[in-house]
């Protein structure tokens, strides 16, 4: 059986995983999920709109995508945040703007950041902003696996499908 | 063989590679095009560079990529902005910059936003800037459908193959 | 079986999973490496810790990823930058930083760029700052080619496995 | 083969519980996730939830959360479905199920009857 | 929770008619659409998932469409073995929840 006799820093690094086995070899199991624009203060995400889509197995489960079936994926996410000028009036404070997504497993009592992204913002005078954050990696998951993000300064997000976005594929 | 009968500059561009034999369902459309250096003020595509190439149907139209077969793609592009301080005779304003991956479709009469970066840059007095944007994401796409980009500061590119380019391949 | 006799914080790391049987013909060479955060002044890439991972050929030589076969690769890399306000008594001086995946390949006797970002920071008085870059693109590699990463900037890395990490997947 | 044989179920007394196992085989057991779905007599088909053996992962209907216990053990290859506080209501075949994709039910057991009854 | 509606709840039909059984969902829910063949005291069988795909070993007479909240299952020829009772299921969110079924049963 894979790993049986491996000493555990083998195991560490051999990390062997379940490769789909898959009746239809050809079943691709992609998402590709966008913000939804009519929810201004939280980020919710949804894949039956505009271009998103969920193939081949992905679900969605409390705002989290559920991995179908054991593997390497590769997973992305971007966010574009804008903010105006503060007023001359009010004390301009740095904003950390920051964007993650993150690994719920029952293995782990707590969510595993598997990618992330931070910014500091120092808004001034008459001086709009806006910032982009993308990020994508390979990731050895497993058959129903919790794929979620985390993002501070969502009242800042530009809530459109071309902007903040979220999705994973097989490999 | 691979390079065969190239000159040293045509092999060292075109990196013909061995591919391993495969079946005609392995077809593996992929593109990966870099900004022409010798157009400043253009942000034109090419695939004859370098290392760009287009692979099993992609090609080139009117400076777009057209899907050469139905499926979902990872679509993904690059730009890199830089630009001198103002000179303090000159007033600064803001810089807006932007890249945008659009798609224009035989079912819609408008091209459509797939992926878009933005940022405000405020350039200041002996402060040279840089600024890199990067997006990419997984699409239902249509053969014949066209793949394109839109920039704003263009004459700001820092056009070079490791910095500026626009690729697709099929999942 | 997989994962038994493993302390949960081995099993945490190792996710030891078990392989189905494959035929050749499936197999998909992927890596993701992560910047090992015990090394503070330099950028050295590790794939036996956390969710980092060599398969189906994949190797590291000298910090460097080792194609395992000739093909098209979608190849990717991310670094997070932060740095603390510049103290009243120093000297403010911009910082240039700057994150590129090169190539080494028997072909060039040097190292060709294939993804490059930059940015220009600005230290102020009381403002910490933190920038993230990211890049990602499809190449034609070579048996035997190898990709590496040159950064400037290292003192200043975010060094966590969400953070900063480098990795690659056969098309 | 994929075979999947539920077992334990019968007369539960309202307010009782039940533990129902499923034993598997013809397959890596820590590859797959398994279901539990249940049907009321004459009725459709609920999803109760599912656990991965591998890591012991599980998702449940919020309708069955707190109600529900689903496990497995890996050295036995078989999976459980414990239910507490049982009503009336409660009474159905439950089946355990193996996904292709996550969400696919592709194999079924042959499902186990629970009545729950004074 | 997504709702799924399925009609008609029963249907009669002889040997080589053409069936359309249909779906509704109570909001749009992509192409995540399964359904599932179910005879009397067995456990049920997939038989198409992702709204058109037809499952491993499932004749071809099945076949089923739709998106986004209508969805159809139609069998071109009923054989003798397709009398039974048919379930969709949406696969887009969970819960991951079931139409009340449609019985066909023999004219």
């Known amino acids: 059986l894979p790993g049986v006799g491996l000493t555990p820093s083998a195991a560490q690094t051999a990390r062997q995983h379940p490769k789909m086995h898959l009746a239809h070899s050809t079943l691709k199991p992609a998402a590709h999920l966008i913000g939804d624009p009519s929810k201004q203060n939280s980020l919710l995400w949804r894949a039956n709109t505009d271009r998103a889509f969920l193939q081949d197995g992905f679900s969605l489960s409390n705002n989290s995508l559920l991995v179908p079936t054991s593997g390497i994926y590769f997973v992305y996410s971007q966010v574009v945040f804008s903010g105006k000028a503060y007023s001359p009036k009010a004390t301009s404070s740095p904003l950390y703007l920051a964007h993650e997504v993150q690994l719920f497993s029952s293995q782990y009592p707590f969510h595993v950041p598997l990618l992330s992204s931070q910014k500091m913002v120092y808004p001034g005078l008459q001086e709009p902003w806006l910032h982009s954050m993308y990020h994508g990696a390979a990731f050895q998951l497993t058959q129903g696996d919790q794929l979620s993000t985390h993002t501070d300064g969502i009242p800042h997000l530009v809530l459109s499908p071309s902007t903040v976005f979220f999705g994973a594929f097989a490999l | 063989l691979p390079g065969v009968g190239l000159t040293p500059s045509a092999a060292q561009t075109a990196r013909q590679h061995p591919k391993m034999h495969l079946a005609h369902s392995t077809l593996k459309p992929a593109a990966h095009l870099i900004g022409d250096p010798s157009k400043q003020n253009s942000l034109l595509w090419r695939a004859n560079t370098d290392r760009a190439f287009l692979q099993d149907g992609f090609s080139l139209s009117n400076n777009s990529l057209l899907v050469p077969t139905s499926g979902i793609y990872f679509v993904y592009s690059q730009v890199v902005f830089s630009g001198k301080a103002y000179s303090p005779k000159a007033t600064s304003s803001p810089l807006y910059l932007a890249h945008e991956v659009q798609l224009f479709s035989s079912q819609y009469p408008f091209h459509v936003p797939l992926l878009s970066s933005q940022k405000m840059v405020y350039p200041g007095l002996q402060e040279p800037w840089l600024h890199s944007m990067y997006h990419g994401a997984a699409f239902q796409l249509t053969q014949g459908d066209q793949l394109s980009t839109h920039t704003d500061g263009i004459p700001h590119l820092v056009l070079s193959p490791s910095t500026v380019f626009f690729g697709a391949f099929a999942l | 079986l997989p994962g038994v006799g493993l302390t949960p914080s081995a099993a945490q790391t190792a996710r030891q999973h078990p392989k189905m049987h494959l035929a050749h013909s499936t197999l998909k060479p992927a890596a993701h490496l992560i910047g090992d955060p015990s090394k503070q002044n330099s950028l050295l890439w590790r794939a036996n810790t956390d969710r980092a991972f060599l398969q189906d050929g994949f190797s590291l030589s000298n910090n460097s990823l080792l194609v395992p076969t000739s093909g098209i690769y979608f190849v990717y890399s991310q670094v997070v930058f932060s740095g603390k306000a510049y103290s009243p008594k120093a000297t403010s001086s911009p910082l240039y930083l700057a994150h590129e995946v090169q190539l080494f390949s028997s072909q060039y006797p040097f190292h060709v760029p294939l993804l490059s970002s930059q940015k220009m920071v600005y230290p102020g008085l009381q403002e910490p700052w933190l920038h993230s870059m990211y890049h990602g693109a499809a190449f034609q590699l070579t048996q035997g080619d190898q990709l590496s990463t040159h950064t400037d900037g290292i003192p200043h890395l975010v060094l966590s496995p969400s953070t900063v990490f480098f990795g690659a997947f056969a098309l | 083969e994929v075979q999947l044989v539920e077992s334990g179920g019968g007369l539960v007394q309202p307010g009782g519980s039940l533990r129902l196992s499923c034993a598997a085989s013809g397959y890596t057991f820590t590859s797959y996730v398994i279901h539990w779905v249940r049907q009321a007599p004459g009725k459709g088909l609920e999803w109760v939830g599912y656990n991965n053996p591998y890591n012991d992962g599980t998702n449940y209907n919020e309708k069955f959360k707190g109600r529900a216990t689903i496990s497995s053990d890996k050295s036995k290859n078989t999976a459980y479905l414990q239910m507490n506080s049982l009503r009336a209501e409660d009474t159905a075949v439950y089946y355990c199920?193996?996904?292709?994709?996550?969400?696919?039910?592709?194999?079924w057991g042959q499902g186990t009857l629970v009545t729950v009854s004074s | 929770d997504i709702q799924m509606t399925q009609s008609p709840s029963s249907l009669s039909a002889s040997v080589g008619d053409r069936v359309t059984i249909t779906c509704r969902a109570s909001?749009?829910?992509?192409?995540?659409v399964a359904w599932y063949q179910q005879k009397p005291g067995k456990a049920p069988k997939l038989q198409i998932y992702s709204a058109s795909h037809r499952y491993t070993g499932v004749p071809s007479r099945f076949s089923g469409s739709g998106s986004g909240t209508d969805f159809t299952l139609t069998i071109s020829s009923l054989q003798p073995e397709d009398f039974a009772t048919y379930y969709c299921q949406q696969h887009y969110s969970t819960p991951w929840t079931f139409g009340q079924g449609t019985k066909v049963e023999i004219k």
């Open positions: 199920s193996r996904p292709t994709m996550l969400p696919w039910f592709a194999y």
């Open positions: 909001q749009a829910v992509s192409s995540a």
